[in-house]
Structures are given as structure tokens and as C-alpha cells.
Interface confidence: low
């Protein structure tokens, strides 16, 4: 492959939180800590900032196979084990064939546990690495184009996802539900809040000509639920309601 090494300014910068971020380790070494009490207070401050980060969206630079850099935003509370699934869904990769490497701003590898929230780690870059089973050079992947989609939910809330416009809503639903923190099995995708007709999950965003939609959690939203549940059942009978194929045990 003939991809240039990106200049530092080419890589998307991680969005810095409004709260004052802790000093990076390289700088704290030279901080004049006058007493043990100050040191404890400083540590407590850093921990507090890290806990604040869990409640914020973290922008990450994601390095895909083929050294292609994309930018994505994840919630700080997302555990590392979910991050792999989330990223692979976003970029059409098989999670069982990839692992994650984390790099800090200083390009040092960051060690993590599967249940560590991403916001607790000062991550600058996430590298999706193919599991090298046979030592062959991975095929460079030109990612399928993604588009920005506005998801409206809970009547007044909005969130943005970047997804493939060619993927069916059935494939996109887990990503949408993850963003809205909804249960996929009890979520309806509608054109807008006023709409009564759930969208056809076999269709893609391009098929439907949509770049904005409404996610309704039928557990929480009482507005015409019984009607919607009937529609859901009807759709389910047609075979395209369930976002996930339930295992036939």
C-alpha cells in the first residue's frame, strides 16, 4: 500500500472536555508538589476529572486496517469490550477477527481491562488490528462511505450517528439503540415523532431517502403504544421486525 504516514495535524483531534483536564504524566513529573497533602489532593482531582470524562462524549481517532484514519465519538461510559463491537459495526468488520490497541497522546500503548470505561483512559487513538492468524499482510480496506444521521428520541433529544447509507435499518438498529440507550427489542424506528408507521427495516437510509429519523422506546413512550405494538407484531410476522436474530435454543 502506498499510503503516506499522516502528519500529526491530519489526525482528528480528540475533543477536549470543558472541565480542566489533568496534566499529562510528562508534565506532572515537573510539578512542584509542596506536601503530601497537595499530592493526595492532586490525585483526587485527577480521579475526579477522569470520572467527569465518563459522563462526556469522547472523540477518538480510529485507525482502520489499511492505515485509514476516521473520527468517531463514543460515550465515556462505554466499556472497552463494547468499544470493539461498536467500532466493528460502524466500519463493517467482523469483531472476532480484530483486536483493539490504544495509544495515548504521547503515542504510548495503554493497557486496559475489558470492563474499563473508555472515558477513564486518556486515549488519543484506537487501532483496529486484524488478528494475524497466518501472518499475511491484511488487505487494505477502503471503508464504505458513511453519512451523518440525526436520531431524534424521547420527544426532545437528538444524537448523531455516522452509518452506511446502504446498510438496512435492521443492521443499523443496534448502533442507533446503543446511542439512545434503548433496548433494541423494544424500539421502533419511525420517520418522525408524529408518524404512526414504523419504517421498513429491510430498507436502507438511501432507499428511504432519510438522513433523520425518530427512535421510539415502546417501554417508555405511552403515545399510541397499543397501536404501535399491533403494527410491530404485524411487521414481526412479516419477518423484519426483530433487530437481532434470536438464537433458536
Amino acid at each position: 500500500m502506498d499510503g503516506r504516514t499522516p502528519r500529526p495535524q491530519d489526525a482528528p483531534a480528540r475533543r477536549k472536555p470543558k472541565a480542566k483536564a489533568p496534566l499529562p504524566p510528562a508534565e506532572t513529573k515537573y510539578t512542584d508538589v509542596s506536601s503530601a497533602a497537595d499530592s493526595v489532593e492532586s490525585t483526587a482531582f485527577i480521579m475526579e476529572q477522569k470520572e467527569n470524562m465518563i459522563d462526556k462524549d469522547v472523540e477518538l481517532s480510529v485507525v482502520l486496517p489499511g492505515d485509514i484514519i476516521k473520527s468517531t465519538t463514543v460515550h465515556g461510559s462505554k466499556p472497552m469490550m463494547d468499544l470493539l463491537i461498536f467500532l466493528c459495526a460502524q466500519y463493517h468488520l467482523n469483531p472476532s477477527s480484530y483486536t483493539i490497541d490504544l495509544l495515548s497522546a504521547e503515542q504510548n500503548h495503554i493497557k486496559f481491562k475489558p470492563n474499563t470505561p473508555i472515558g477513564m483512559l486518556e486515549v488519543e487513538k484506537v487501532i483496529l488490528k486484524p488478528k494475524m492468524l497466518d501472518k499475511k499482510k491484511p488487505t487494505p480496506i477502503i471503508p464504505e462511505k458513511t453519512v451523518r444521521v440525526v436520531i431524534n428520541f424521547k420527544k426532545t433529544q437528538k444524537t448523531i450517528v455516522r452509518v452506511s447509507p446502504h446498510a438496512s435499518l435492521q443492521e443499523l438498529a443496534p448502533i442507533i439503540c446503543s446511542k439512545c440507550e434503548f433496548d433494541p427489542l423494544h424500539t421502533l424506528l419511525l420517520k418522525d415523532y408524529q408518524s404512526q408507521e414504523p419504517l421498513d427495516l429491510t430498507k436502507s437510509l438511501n432507499d428511504l431517502g432519510l438522513r433523520e429519523l425518530y427512535a421510539m422506546d415502546v417501554n417508555r413512550e405511552s403515545c399510541q403504544i397499543s397501536q404501535n405494538l399491533d403494527i410491530m407484531k404485524e411487521k414481526e410476522n412479516k419477518g423484519f421486525f426483530s433487530f437481532f436474530q434470536r438464537s433458536k435454543k
Epitope: 489526525a11 484514519i69 462511505k145
Partner: antibody, heavy 116, light 113 residues
Framework: EVQLVESGGGLVKPGGSLKLSCAAS????????MYWVRQTPEKRLEWVAA????????YYPDSVKGRFTISRDNAKNNLYLQMSSLKSEDTAMYYC?????????WGQGTTLTVSS | DVVMTQTPLSLPVSLGDQASISCRSS???????????LHWYLQKPGQSPKLLIY???NRFSGVPDRFSGSGSGTDFTLKISRVEAEDLGVYFC??????????FGGGTKLEIK
């Protein structure tokens, strides 16, 4: 409406240089990989260069590597192909194309003739 | 590099007939992500190529349903159910599974018998 308009073609002597341009409109330019593809006088299509949507990554076939440079200006919605050390076998119609994993829109092309 | 071979080189047809163009790749075009990145383009006389079919069988927007793509692995086919005058031109297959380089077939000229 997606539009790609190439310009800059012409007659060049072997060993010479030329820069092609492609003006894009009707879509968010910075969202797409862009490509140059050429069509030889025998009507064969050959991919010549590719550039990532942000401009950080460039790709070339061995036949042009080291001689051609693809670049883009996302602020101006322009794609470029700087060609040097031109050879007679570079004679072709040059198209710019948009896409990620297929070329969904092509320009009308600009002709390069390399001859002494 | 993946070599794409198209047959026939030229395909004389009568209007209203069915036409079939074959494309064979030197290696499987099934990507590790499960997709097959095989596409078809049509270049009408005096025009630039236009996308017809992407990922084996998906018609691009505005492409009539008389065009259909099929195949898997290394063997692919483009069918035109009833040839119309506007379908005449050169058809190219192309792959983007193993990239770079992006590679094209040599083309098949659809012409009136």
C-alpha cells in the same frame, strides 16, 4: 446534482510535466475518496491514483508511482493530479471519479497526449 | 494484482433480445468482511463511464430494472433482459476487494446485429 469537471489536459513532450484539475460540486467533497482513472487509446480503463477524503492517504499503481502526485483542496472542492516525467504510454483520456468502494460519478474527462 | 477478464469482446444483439456479459477474476472477490466488491459500468459512445451495478447485484440509482448482476467468488454475469438502443456501448467490470490497485476488465462492446 453531482458534477465533476476536469481541466488541464494538452499536448506534452516526453519527459515533460502537466497538472490536471477536477472541480467538484453538488456534494460534500470532504466526505469522499476521490480517484483519477485514465482510458488509453485502446479504450482500456486504468486506475491512476486515489486519495482519502481528508487527503492524508494517497495510493498509486506501480506504473505511475514516483511520477504522479494526487492532492486535494477540500476548501475549494478541487482535486489535482500533478504528472511529471511523462511517457508516451501516459497518453490517455483522464477522468476524475468520486467514490469509496466503487466509482459512482465520473467527470467528462480531459485528454493528455504525450508526443515529440 | 487481480486480473479481470471479460467475455465476449464484442456482443452483437437485436433490439429486444437478452444479452449476457461474463466477467472472471483471477482470485476470489469475497472480502474478509463478507462483501463482494464487483461492479459494472457502461460507457456510451462519446461519454464517460457510468456506474450500473455495485457489489455484484445492486442497481445504482436511476438504472432500469432490465439490468441485473449475479455471480460469486470469481465468476460474475451482467444480464440485460430486453436490449434497448440506449443500452449500446462498452460494458466494464471492476473490482475493489483487493485494493490497491483498483482493476477493470477489458470491456465488452454491445452493438446492433
Amino acid at each position: 446534482e453531482v458534477q465533476l469537471v476536469e481541466s488541464g489536459g494538452g499536448l506534452v513532450k516526453p519527459g515533460g510535466s502537466l497538472k490536471l484539475s477536477c472541480a467538484a460540486s453538488g456534494f460534500t467533497f470532504s466526505d469522499y475518496y476521490m480517484y483519477w482513472v485514465r482510458q488509453t487509446p485502446e479504450k482500456r480503463l486504468e486506475w491512476v491514483a486515489a486519495i482519502s477524503n481528508g487527503g492524508s492517504y494517497t495510493y498509486y499503481p506501480d506504473s505511475v508511482k514516483g511520477r504522479f502526485t494526487i492532492s486535494r483542496d477540500n476548501a475549494k472542492n478541487n482535486l489535482y493530479l500533478q504528472m511529471s516525467s511523462l511517457k508516451s504510454e501516459d497518453t490517455a483520456m483522464y477522468y476524475c471519479a468520486r467514490g469509496d468502494y466503487y466509482f459512482d460519478y465520473w467527470g467528462q474527462g480531459t485528454t493528455l497526449t504525450v508526443s515529440s | 494484482d487481480v486480473v479481470m477478464t471479460q467475455t465476449p469482446l464484442s456482443l452483437p444483439v437485436s433490439l429486444g433480445d437478452q444479452a449476457s456479459i461474463s466477467c472472471r477474476s483471477s482470485q476470489s472477490l469475497v472480502h474478509s468482511n463478507g462483501n463482494t466488491y464487483l461492479h459494472w459500468y457502461l460507457q456510451k459512445p462519446g461519454q464517460s463511464p457510468k456506474l450500473l451495478i455495485y457489489k455484484v447485484s445492486n442497481r445504482f440509482s436511476g438504472v432500469p430494472d432490465r439490468f441485473s448482476g449475479s455471480g460469486s467468488g470469481t465468476d460474475f454475469t451482467l444480464k440485460i433482459s430486453r436490449v434497448e438502443a440506449e443500452d449500446l456501448g462498452v460494458y466494464f467490470c471492476s473490482q475493489s476487494t483487493h485494493v490497491p490497485p483498483w482493476t477493470f476488465g477489458g470491456g465488452t462492446k454491445l452493438e446492433i446485429k
